[in-house]
């Protein structure tokens, strides 16, 4: 759909005569008839297939035609068409003399024709006017013409319909070729799809208007890229919704059981070393000079047994003093007055030089001890059995009878309760002083993680159209994360797509 526009500019008829040569009385009151039709190699009479238009009397004999388009007048002349512009045309322009006021063809004498011109050719749609001038023996007509598209029609042939809109059916303006140009923030074939906030997660986020990012169930954050952990999850994270994966040092269904008391509470004082030994349980290894559960008590300096070779320690205001046994001297009784050459070892002990002869050490036979093998051994006096084991003297040797849960020569080894993998369903086992503890994965509880605490609501595949299913552990229900184009609690309804031409 478009308009053929013809702008008459000047008509010259100096002698004021008709085509027959007869003069007009008193002058040629001139009006024009225009016929637009399909292309003909030789323009012939016949129907004006593209349309006709007539003007009122525009002047007498010779005159210039005023441009009346701004004032709602009839110049340029409009010849609308409701078809694809073919690119070629034929045009006939007749100038007539009007003796009276009735300009209808049947009301005029046949010899009222002043002049007739006929042209044909090709014409592309465009804003530019083509200027032409036709001259006969008695007259001259200067005019210009063009073809433009009607409102909302575009393209080389005015065949593409495009009407800008900003509503539910689309958000666009039209390009010169008739293609849609989406308004900022919209995309898609008909510019119906909003462009979400930059970075908004493709699957976990969506939007109903531009620069928005609304999260699907189980997701949060400005870009919907953070999963929501299980309700009540204390010291844990998630990689998919409703999970509770415990941070290091935490256990339990809600990651609220402290397995790393040392790091979280730093209970050991005075530079002591802390070791975790179960839930909310720890052991402090004190530095010399300190004691107490948390190494909070300062020891007497002698409590660290600084005196060597059987020296006895005496506390003093400014420290301590070692009273050395006979044969030893030095701050810690670390030096000997004798060497192996003096045969210092008793009871058949063998002497070994140390520090290039500055010291010696006695290697005692069984049943003897002391720096110089001077003491007979009671093998149980040193309480060699650990963890409450009972020491039994057996002649030259001794034996430890261990309490349940301990083993080894000195009952020093803890029999691991975890060795037999007692925790079910992938639970983590922790050896404690008086037994064991299982840290259960999400969905299981009980002393050995044997109780399933939640039903997998996703097991029955309740979500349609390839939606992702998540189990909400707090309610034992499922949540469907719909792909683009589907809605509903099970993603069962397709979003209504627009018709091919929504206008």
């Amino acid at each position: 759909s478009g308009v053929f526009q013809l702008q008459l500019q000047e008509f010259i008829n100096e002698r004021g005569v008709l085509a027959s040569g007869r003069p007009c009385e008193p002058g040629c009151r001139t009006f024009f008839r225009v016929c637009l039709k399909h292309f003909q190699a030789v323009v012939s009479p016949g129907p004006c297939t593209f349309g006709t238009v007539s003007t009122p009397v525009l002047g007498t004999n010779s005159f210039a035609v005023r441009d009346d388009s701004s004032g709602g007048g009839r110049n340029p002349l409009q010849l609308p068409f409701n078809f694809t512009w073919p690119g070629t045309f034929s045009l006939i322009i007749e100038a007539w003399h009007a003796p009276g006021d009735d300009l209808r063809p049947e009301a005029l004498p046949p010899d009222a024709l002043i002049s007739k011109i006929a042209i044909q050719g090709s014409l592309a749609v465009g804003q530019n006017w083509l200027l032409d001038e036709q001259t006969s023996t008695l007259t001259r007509l200067r005019y210009s013409y063009r073809v433009i598209c009607s409102d909302n029609y575009y393209g080389d042939n005015c065949s593409r319909l495009c009407k800008k809109r900003n509503d539910h059916f689309g958000h666009y303006v039209c390009q010169p070729d008739g293609n849609l140009s989406c308004l900022p923030g919209w995309t898609g074939e008909y510019c119906q799809q909003p462009i979400c906030l930059s970075g908004c997660h493709e699957q976990n986020g969506y939007c109903s208007k531009p620069a928005e990012c609304l999260c699907r169930p189980g997701w949060q954050g400005r870009l919907c890229n953070e999963c929501i952990p299980h309700n009540g999850c204390r010291h844990g994270t998630c990689s998919t919704p409703w999970q509770c994966t415990c941070d290091e040092g935490w256990g339990g269904l809600f990651c609220d059981q402290d397995l790393n008391y040392c790091t979280h509470h730093s209970p050991c004082k005075n530079g002591a070393t802390c070791s975790n030994s179960g839930q909310r349980s720890y052991t402090c290894t004190c530095r010399p000079g300190y004691t107490g559960v948390d190494c909070e008590l300062e020891l007497s300096e002698c409590d660290s047994n600084p005196c060597r070779n059987g020296g006895s320690c005496k506390d003093q205001e400014d420290g301590y003093h070692c009273l050395c046994p006979p044969g030893y001297y030095g701050l810690h009784c670390e030096h000997s007055t004798l060497s192996c050459a003096d045969s210092p070892c008793f009871n058949g002990g063998s002497c070994r030089e140390r520090n290039q002869g500055a010291n010696y050490a006695c290697e005692c036979p069984p049943n003897f001890t002391g720096s110089n093998c001077e003491k007979k051994v009671d093998r149980c006096t040193s309480n060699p059995c650990a963890n409450g084991g009972q020491c039994l003297n057996r002649g030259p040797s001794r034996m430890c009878r261990c309490r349940p849960g301990f083993t080894g020569t000195y009952c020093e080894l803890h029999v691991s309760d975890c060795a037999r993998n007692p925790c079910a369903h992938g639970g983590t086992c922790h050896d404690l002083e008086n037994g064991l503890m299982c840290t259960c994965p999400a969905g299981f509880s009980g002393r050995r993680c044997e109780v399933r605490t939640s039903i997998d609501a996703c097991a029955s595949s309740p979500c349609f159209n390839r939606a992702t299913c998540y189990t909400d552990l707090s309610t034992d229900t499922f949540v469907c994360n719909c792909p683009y184009g589907f809605v509903g609690s099970r993603c069962e309804f397709p979003v209504g797509l627009p018709p091919s031409f929504p206008w």
Partner: nanobody
């Protein structure tokens, strides 16, 4: 029981010399070593020098290079002290390291002799 008698102490100028002697008497068991300890005022008794039957000698760091210990025989010991300093002042005790009837080592001590070094 062993008795130890010291001699040779006295007052001396800094840089001077003294010679201490000690003799053991009485029911003498096996003596393995003899030597000298010093007790400065307000301080603990500390070893100065010792020599064993096998001629093993030990010196305190402060005595090295200035003092010389020697065993004249099994029952006597001497300490030659040269280039004396004020910090060498104190009571010098002779001692002997000996065995008893029950096999172990025992220290026997003398009464002590005063050494005073003036500056």
């Amino acid at each position: 029981e062993v008795q130890l008698v010291e001699s040779g102490g006295g007052l001396v100028q800094a840089g001077g010399s003294l010679r201490l002697s000690c003799a053991a008497s009485g029911d003498i068991p096996r003596i393995a070593a003899m030597g000298w300890y010093r007790q400065a005022p307000g301080k603990q008794r500390e070893l100065v020098a010792t020599v064993s039957n096998a001629a093993t000698t030990r010196y305190a760091d402060s005595a090295k290079g200035r003092f010389t210990i020697s065993r004249d025989n099994a029952k006597t010991v001497s300490l030659q002290m040269d280039n004396l300093k004020p910090e060498d002042t104190g009571v010098y005790y002779c001692y002997s390291l000996a065995t008893t009837v029950t096999p172990s080592w025992v220290n026997y001590w003398g009464q002590g002799t005063q050494v005073t070094v003036s500056s």
